[in-house]
């Protein structure tokens, strides 16, 4: 048995899970998730099992070997995947455990922005960056780009304090994940400013 | 110093394949998406297609997907091209780059790697 | 695929002029567009991202402006060492497709 492997998929894409085997005579071997039997190989009679119907166009063996490929991922198949070899010639069979994450691909990032108050010229507000669909382990970063400046801001919020007279800014959000990246339209600090100007509440960018 | 050395261009026959390599050092390659560019003799550049971090997404140009297969080595800090079934109009300079602060642009290339398909 | 389209395959400008390269994407893109400057038997490099944004150590004589579907480098005061080919390419959706590039001439 060796360390948890852990293994990253997107939805809709393919993950292999890798399988390497010095046991000799190999009996059969099985792949669970989760608990249950996903798919039995007994090599001697070249017989592959699986378990449920859904999962049969989307298991497959490549190169001949007992490495398990998924494809078509679904969020539902992150999780605890275990792999059993059984032999005659082994007291206990060979263990191997993997961890599954499938994570989306991101759409847009969308923006919102919070309560502003205009105060000597000075425009102050924040920026939130959310993906509209609730994706998790997403990780927000704010450009701020414009003639003076030209700085990055971790985290969804993004505290903005625009003079009136200074040169316009540009506001971009770029979330992550572990399998795609994609970055929010642009937002410009005068049309944000001269916006709420007319309506203090918080609204969509 | 960041770095990017491609190698294993060279000549190859119509219909053949090729595996292009690509060496990353002096940052965190593991950290970041790699892409490769090709660019024929006295034309545009093309992207090829991207890989992230941990090889779990690959994103093609669609008119090359099914010739080109890009993956990766973190361990070796390493990136690679197979490239399958050539033709003469894959005649190039092959450059593999990174973005720039894993964003959308490159900011380091490397100095490119002429692949000739003749006979 | 987004096509970038620069019109101009060859611009020949002086020494101290200031000249314009221009980039039409087949749809709007933003401001997801990159310039990319290529000296002969160089690799390229990065000069303007988000449209408008200087790499670092990038010249401030370059320029980008733009949003949508048109965009502009503009060199002033151009130098000798700026005869390379210029390249603006879009990263608004896959797949990244680059302009056909402007070689830059220098009279």
């Known amino acids: 048995s060796g360390p948890v492997k852990e293994l990253v998929g997107s939805v809709g894409g393919a993950v292999t899970f890798p399988l390497k085997s010095k046991v000799k005579q190999v009996d059969s071997i099985v792949w669970t998730f989760n608990t249950t039997p996903l798919v039995t190989i007994q090599p001697e009679g070249g017989t592959i099992i699986v378990t449920q119907n859904r999962n049969r166009e989307r298991v497959d063996f490549p190169d001949g070997g007992y490495s398990l490929k998924l494809s078509k991922l679904k969020k539902n198949d992150s999780g605890i995947y275990y792999v059993g070899i059984y032999s005659s010639s082994l007291q206990q069979p060979s263990t191997q455990e993997y961890v599954l994450h499938v994570y989306e691909h991101l759409s847009k990032p969308k923006v919102t922005m919070g309560l502003q108050s205009n105060k000597n010229g000075t425009c102050v507000t924040n920026l939130t960056c959310c993906m509209e669909h609730g994706e998790e382990d997403v990780i927000y970063t704010w450009k701020a780009l414009g003639q003076a400046a030209n700085e990055s801001h971790n985290g969804s919020i993004l505290p903005i304090s625009w003079r009136w007279g200074e040169s316009d800014m540009t506001f971009i959000c770029v979330a992550r994940n572990p399998v795609s990246r994609n970055f929010s339209s642009p937002i410009l600090a005068r049309k944000l400013c001269e916006g709420a100007a007319d309506d203090p509440d918080s609204s969509m960018v | 110093e960041v770095q990017l050395v491609e190698s294993g261009g060279g000549l190859v026959q119509p219909g053949g394949s090729l595996r292009l390599s690509c060496a990353a050092s002096g940052f965190d390659f593991s950290r970041y998406w790699m892409s490769w560019v090709r660019q024929a003799p006295g034309k545009g550049l093309e992207w090829i297609g991207e890989?992230?971090?941990?090889?779990?997404?690959?994103n093609y140009a669609p008119s090359l997907k099914d010739k080109f297969i890009i993956s990766r080595d973190n361990a070796k800090n390493s990136l690679y091209l197979q490239m399958n079934s050539l033709r003469a109009e894959d005649t190039a300079v092959y450059y593999c780059?990174?973005?720039?602060?894993?964003?959308?642009?490159?900011?380091?290339w490397g100095q490119g790697t002429l692949v000739t398909v003749s006979s | 695929d987004i096509v970038m389209t620069q019109s101009h395959k060859f611009m020949s400008t002086s020494v101290g002029d200031r000249v314009s390269i221009t980039c039409k994407a087949s749809?709007?893109?933003?401001?997801?567009v990159a310039w990319y400057q290529q000296k002969p038997g160089q690799s390229p490099k990065l000069l303007i991202y988000w449209a408008s944004t200087r790499h670092t150590g990038v010249p401030d004589r370059f320029t980008g402006s733009g949003s949508g579907t048109d965009f502009t480098l503009t060199i002033s005061n151009v130098q000798s060492e700026d005869l390379a080919d210029y390249f603006c390419q879009q990263y608004s959706s896959y797949p990244y497709t680059f302009g056909g590039g402007t070689k830059l001439e220098i009279k």
């Open positions: 780059a990174r973005p720039d602060g894993n964003y959308w642009y490159f900011d380091v």
């Open positions: 749809q709007d893109v933003g401001i997801a």
């Open positions: 890989i992230n971090p941990d090889s779990s997404t690959i």
